[in-house]
């Protein structure tokens, strides 16, 4: 986890201001509206899980 303004989150993760921590971009498949998903590299749309 990173503090904002310091080194970026590790590959495959992005900073969430709401949760105050780096979060996994992979979780954007299930929760695409999470704030940190804006910072994740665009990927082809995946099947959306229930």
């Amino acid at each position: 986890e990173q503090a904002p303004g310091t080194a970026p989150c590790s590959r495959g993760s992005s900073w969430s201001a709401a949760l105050d921590k780096c979060m996994d971009c992979a979780s954007c498949r299930a929760r695409p509206h999470s704030d940190f998903c804006l910072g994740c590299a665009a990927a082809p749309p995946a099947p959306f899980r229930l």
Partner: antibody, heavy 119, light 111 residues
């Protein structure tokens, strides 16, 4: 420090009811999805139920084996969630764990509580 | 439901050697970008502990002796070099869809 503290469990007769509780601390509870996972020698680790966050309309999902019998709920104001179990049968016997997930993996776990369904 | 098949059910590995545990899903649990497969370690009397998320991403605080690989339907957990403290049961779990399901577990013994 993240903690999930469980209560409830014990011995219940077949056809009886039991309510399990889990109180969370040390993380942003309201943003996380919460699940119950049970474990038995016969079935191993088995996901039971999930309740999502307010932003996901508190959607609930259940394993087929407990649909209509178990009800999951949460109280974000007190960082706690519950599993109401009705019409219990011997096959519901096991260790029940509460767990949190942002979306995919079970990150934090409670200590587990034993449920025995027997006459 | 997606069935997770773990092999072997148990294994004994000499201290300092490599332990390899396999998990096969009954259908693909991967996109072109990520695999929705996770690994846990469980010791007697304790809840499972997350080791690897998304097939290969090491959870914070987990020693680099643990590594995960695979995509699609076939995944592997490697532990090298194994230490005495690694005696435990290891489980895989997918999050591709509901219901989430776990493998049957692999009991690791250190010789």
């Amino acid at each position: 420090q993240v903690q999930l503290q469980q209560s409830g469990g014990g011995l219940v007769q077949p056809g009886g009811s039991m309510k399990l509780s889990c109180i969370a601390s040390g993380f942003t509870f309201s943003s996380y999805w919460m699940s119950w996972v049970r474990q038995s020698p016969e079935k191993g680790l088995e996901w039971v139920a999930e309740i999502r966050s307010k932003s996901d309309n508190y959607a609930t999902h259940y394993a087929e084996s407990v649909k209509g019998k178990f009800t999951i709920s949460r109280d974000d104001s007190k960082s706690r969630f519950f599993l109401q179990m009705n019409n219990l049968r011997a096959e519901d016997t096991g260790i029940y764990y509460c767990s949190s997930t942002y979306a995919d993996y079970f990150h934090y776990w409670g200590q587990g509580t034993d449920l025995t369904v027997s006459s | 439901d997606i069935v997770m098949t773990q092999t072997p059910a148990s294994l004994a590995v000499s201290l300092g050697q490599r332990a390899t545990i396999s998990c096969r899903a009954s259908q693909s649990v991967s996109t072109s970008t990520y695999s929705y497969m996770h690994w846990y370690q469980q010791k007697p009397g304790q809840p499972p502990k997350l080791l690897i998320k998304y097939a290969s991403s090491l959870e914070s605080g987990v020693p680099a002796r643990f590594s995960g690989s695979g995509s699609g339907t076939d995944f592997t957990l490697n532990i090298h070099p194994v230490e005495e403290d690694d005696t435990a049961t290891y489980y895989c779990q997918h999050s591709w869809e509901i219901p989430y399901t776990f493998g049957g577990g692999t009991k690791l013994e250190i010789k």
